[in-house]
C-alpha cells in the first residue's frame, strides 16, 4: 500500500504569464494541499504538458468553466 503520509506534494511556485487558448487545454486540477504556498490551478494541455496558473485571474476561471462545460450539458 502507498504511504499517504509520505506521498509527494505538487505545488506551484510560479504562474504562467500568458493566457492559454482553451483549445489547447485538456483538463485541470486544483492544488489543495495546505503545504503549498500559493493557491493554484494546474492545467494539462492536449500534449500532456502541465502549466501552473493563478485561479484569481478571470481567464483561468473562464477556462475551468469551459472545461467543465465539456463534461455535461448545462441548463442556463
Amino acid at each position: 500500500q502507498p504511504d499517504a503520509i509520505n506521498a509527494p506534494v505538487t505545488c506551484c511556485y510560479n504562474f504562467t504569464n500568458r493566457k492559454i487558448s482553451v483549445q489547447r487545454l485538456a483538463s485541470y486540477r486544483r492544488i489543495t494541499s495546505s503545504k503549498c504556498p500559493k493557491e493554484a490551478v494546474i492545467f494539462k494541455t492536449i500534449v500532456a504538458k502541465e502549466i501552473c496558473a493563478d485561479p484569481k485571474q478571470k481567464w483561468v476561471q473562464d477556462s475551468m468553466d469551459h472545461l467543465d462545460k465539456q463534461t455535461q450539458t448545462p441548463k442556463t
Partner: nanobody
C-alpha cells in the same frame, strides 16, 4: 483550505419552498465551481445541482429540474439552492461542495465539503 457552512434547512410540507445557503471562506470563492449534493438515509450521496464560477451556467439532476434553482453571489462568497415544489423524496441531508477537478456531477471532483443541512419534507 476552503470552509463551507450550509444553512436554511428545516421541516416543511410537500409543495412548500426552502432556500439553502452556503457561505464560503478561506480561498478565492469565484475560482470554484460550486455544487449541491444530497444524501438520504441508507442511500448514496447524489448530485443535485452545480453552478459555474461565473454563474452563467447551472447544471441540474433530472429529478430536480424545473423545481430547484442554483445561484451564487461572488461578492458575498455564497451559493444558494432555491427549492420549490418540494416532495417527500427530497428529504435528505444537503451538502455544499467546492470543486477541485474538472467535472460537474461527480462528487469525486469536489475537494471541499460542508457539514450539511437537514431538509425534511412531510406529506
Amino acid at each position: 483550505e476552503v470552509q463551507l457552512v450550509e444553512s436554511g434547512g428545516g421541516l416543511v410540507q410537500a409543495g412548500d419552498s426552502l432556500r439553502l445557503s452556503c457561505a464560503a471562506s478561506g480561498r478565492t470563492f469565484s475560482s470554484y465551481r460550486m455544487g449541491w449534493f444530497r444524501q438520504a438515509p441508507g442511500k448514496e450521496r447524489e448530485f443535485v445541482a452545480a453552478i459555474s464560477r461565473s454563474g452563467a451556467s447551472a447544471y441540474y439532476a433530472d429529478s430536480v429540474k424545473g423545481r430547484f434553482t442554483c445561484s451564487r453571489d461572488n461578492a458575498k462568497d455564497t451559493v444558494y439552492l432555491q427549492m420549490n415544489k418540494l416532495k417527500p423524496e427530497d428529504t435528505a441531508v444537503y451538502y455544499c461542495a467546492a470543486s477541485s477537478r474538472m467535472g460537474v456531477d461527480d462528487p469525486e471532483t469536489y475537494g471541499y465539503w460542508g457539514q450539511g443541512t437537514q431538509v425534511t419534507v412531510s406529506s
